[in-house]
């Protein structure tokens, strides 16, 4: 039966990509989210559609990335911002949006900036206006770290499975 | 011999690369692309040129990367464009710049998006102008499917191996 | 003992985060480092601070990674950008704003472009301005290959460990 | 419903200093900026300056920097203004306004006297 | 500085009144970027804080009412009543934000005849 002797979310997978004969053995932490587009003013992350997915003990808790076994992971993220005419009023200064994937550990009692893009874009000036923002790192992490993100300008956000996602696998 | 016993992408890698003893159980599927900076007016991925390869079973056919096994891979691209205002007129109208990597699957009819980055520009009101789109993402991806590209702003393009290329690895 | 029979840098990597059970044979050499944020005016790579670390043979030497086993690596790097205009005459002339990874090999005599990203910021018109640079791909590599970057705009980075970073890992 | 709300005003001695509030809601503030606008009693509107919650970015009236300090808190949504070496010509009404949407706040009244 | 300068300080009209304020700057408040002008006209009535009404020099705020108009480009720009309302007494002001500091006209106080 395609998936027995998985895990769960590896069943899953095989249940999903019934071509795909996964050896448990080689399966390694991975997760793809992406941001839930029913939601306009916050960013959700989903993995249960689309091409989102949790893998060997990868869950999502508190809109955080609940990192399963210690190790290496590359950890990556992609926002894209969009604007239209008119939308400034009485300003001609810059709008701010960055995008940060923060690390919450039992090491240390605060969020820790892993990943951080910014950029000023000034609306009233270019309109309609577009921005994509992507970044992504190797990092050392521990069983139970909790991987999120922090947003600036989520009003701004185009949301679409292809435009704004956040994930990690383990190395 | 060298290669002796590998696929023929591992051999070509191994001859290339004296140095590298690569047993094949540890080798993934790898592919790396890049434009091809003699096409200006189109973007057609080469494998056989520069830094780019092909390794462990990825193949190239129709400008689409061809998935050799089921797994889940880290698929990335990025590319640079360039121009210079063509007259005062530009003002009024901005640039659509965009860049896409598509999946086309025995399981859907249609080309899906798996990675998309977009950009306004303004040639008119700030010449030259320069701008860099990269993202990258893990997918669960299904033997034989296809991984291609679309962009916005062909003409556009600075066409070079560091600047414009496409990848895939098996995770 | 946490460590014993690891490398140097996966003992260290053990000590580090003493709930990780690293099998040696499972390591593989990945690589992060920050830009040192108390040199304002160059770009100097650290690995010994914040989330930055060598893992399984990679080390760094005058500002290079040394890639420690023949192999197909991925390498990634982001920069940063800010500033503020000096004076009205910057409307006038665009910045350019450039971040390339480099290779140096012994199969070449000269500093290969391995990741290229590029950007014209126009100070005069939009300040204060931010901009953020990310690229990496799968790179087929050699032992003893350095790995290097060179910056337009070193003035206007804005150094930060999640900011201004250069990573590698073996696939 | 968006509100910006000041607080802080009241009496203060020549010399002295005070800190103001802008207390933000019903919108997403770290990306826009929070003006700071001040008003003496029967006279026109100044602008003091502003501030990028989320950047930290400032901008100064050339008349006020040095005196005045612009700082935000993202997590409270809160913008201030610190003003020192205060004078009698500072009394005013302050307000705080994000350009953007063309929110302002309700003013508060800053009277320096000894 | 930008200067700003209204004119007139002060107008007495009645209700149903056609009224125009003009507002000069003392340089151009034209974007070539986009081809609009920095400007605003707020309205302030007494002990509360101002309203915009205008942005961009032409661009009426949501929920101002129709008889508000703005017009001009670069240096000289207009604030129309076109049918002066008894909640439309007030002081108005213009102001550029086309660079900085911004600032504000002097104010154009409107009375009841």
């Known amino acids: 039966l395609p998936g027995v002797g998985l895990t769960p979310s590896a069943a899953q997978t095989a249940r999903q990509h019934p071509k795909m004969h996964l050896a448990h053995s080689t399966l390694k932490p991975a997760a793809h989210l992406i941001g839930d587009p029913s939601k306009q003013n916050s960013l959700l992350w989903r993995a249960n559609t689309d091409r989102a997915f949790l893998q060997d003990g990868f869950s999502l808790s508190n809109n955080s990335l609940l990192v399963p076994t210690s190790g290496i992971y590359f950890v990556y993220s992609q926002v894209v911002f969009s604007g239209k005419a008119y939308s400034p009023k009485a300003t001609s200064s810059p709008l701010y949006l960055a995008h940060e994937v923060q690390l919450f550990s039992s090491q240390y009692p605060f969020h820790v900036p892993l990943l951080s893009s910014q950029k000023m874009v000034y609306p009233g000036l270019q309109e309609p206006w577009l921005h994509s923002m992507y970044h992504g790192a190797a990092f050392q992490l521990t069983q139970g770290d909790q991987l999120s993100t922090h947003t600036d300008g989520i009003p701004h956000l185009v949301l679409s499975p292809s435009t704004v996602f956040f994930g990690a696998f383990a190395l | 011999l060298p290669g002796v016993g590998l696929t023929p992408s591992a051999a070509q890698t191994a001859r290339q690369h004296p140095k590298m003893h690569l047993a094949h159980s540890t080798l993934k599927p790898a592919a790396h692309l890049i434009g091809d900076p003699s096409k200006q007016n189109s973007l057609l991925w080469r494998a056989n040129t520069d830094r780019a390869f092909l390794q462990d079973g990825f193949s190239l056919s129709n400008n689409s990367l061809l998935v050799p096994t089921s797994g889940i891979y880290f698929v990335y691209s990025q590319v640079v464009f360039s121009g210079k205002a063509y007259s005062p007129k530009a003002t009024s109208s901005p640039l659509y710049l965009a860049h896409e990597v598509q999946l086309f699957s025995s399981q859907y009819p249609f080309h899906v998006p798996l990675l998309s980055s977009q950009k306004m520009v303004y040639p008119g009101l700030q010449e030259p102008w320069l701008h860099s789109m990269y993202h990258g993402a893990a997918f669960q991806l299904t033997q034989g499917d296809q991984l291609s590209t679309h962009t916005d702003g062909i003409p556009h393009l600075v066409l070079s191996p560091s600047t414009v290329f496409f990848g895939a690895f098996a995770l | 003992l946490p460590g014993v029979g690891l490398t140097p840098s996966a003992a260290q990597t053990a000590r580090q985060h003493p709930k990780m059970h690293l099998a040696h044979s499972t390591l593989k050499p990945a690589a992060h480092l920050i830009g040192d944020p108390s040199k304002q005016n160059s770009l100097l790579w650290r690995a010994n601070t914040d989330r930055a670390f060598l893992q399984d043979g990679f080390s760094l030497s005058n500002n290079s990674l040394l890639v420690p086993t023949s192999g197909i690596y991925f390498v990634y790097s982001q920069v940063v950008f800010s500033g503020k205009a000096y004076s009205p005459k910057a409307t006038s002339s665009p910045l350019y704003l450039a971040h390339e990874v480099q290779l140096f090999s012994s199969q070449y005599p000269f500093h290969v472009p391995l990741l290229s990203s590029q950007k014209m910021v126009y100070p005069g018109l939009q300040e204060p301005w931010l901009h953020s640079m990310y690229h990496g791909a799968a790179f087929q590599l050699t032992q003893g290959d350095q790995l290097s970057t060179h910056t337009d705009g070193i003035p206007h980075l804005v150094l930060s460990p999640s900011t201004v970073f250069f990573g590698a890992f073996a696939l | 419903e968006v509100q910006l709300v000041e607080s802080g005003g009241g009496l203060v001695q020549p010399g002295g200093s005070l800190r103001l509030s802008c207390a933000a809601s019903g919108y997403t503030f770290s990306s826009y900026w929070i003006e700071w606008v001040r008003q003496a009693p029967g006279k026109g509107l100044e602008w003091v300056g502003e501030?990028?919650?989320?950047?930290?970015?400032?901008n100064y009236n050339e008349e006020f920097k040095g005196r005045a300090t612009f700082s935000a808190d993202n997590s409270k949504n809160t913008a201030y203004l610190q003003m020192n070496s205060l004078r009698a010509e500072d009394t005013a009404v302050y307000y705080c306004?994000?350009?953007?949407?063309?929110?302002w706040g309700q003013g508060t009244l800053v009277t320096v006297s000894s | 500085d930008i200067q700003m300068t209204q004119s007139p300080s002060s107008l007495s009209a009645s209700v149903g009144d056609r009224v125009t304020i003009t507002c000069k700057s003392s340089q151009s408040l034209l974007y070539s970027t986009n081809q609009k002008n920095a400007l605003a006209w707020y309205q302030q009535k007494p002990g509360k804080a101002p309203k915009l009404l205008i942005y961009?020099?032409?661009t009426r705020d949501s929920g101002v009412p129709s008889r508000f108009s703005g017009s001009g480009s670069g240096t000289d720009f207009t604030l129309t009543i076109s049918s002066l309302q008894p909640e439309d007494f007030a002081t108005y002001y213009c102001q550029q934000y086309y660079s900085y500091p911004r600032t504000f006209g002097q104010g154009t106080k409107v009375e009841i005849k």
């Open positions: 501030i990028s919650p989320g950047s930290g970015s400032t």
């Open positions: 306004a994000d350009g953007y949407h063309g929110y």
């Open positions: 961009w020099a032409s």
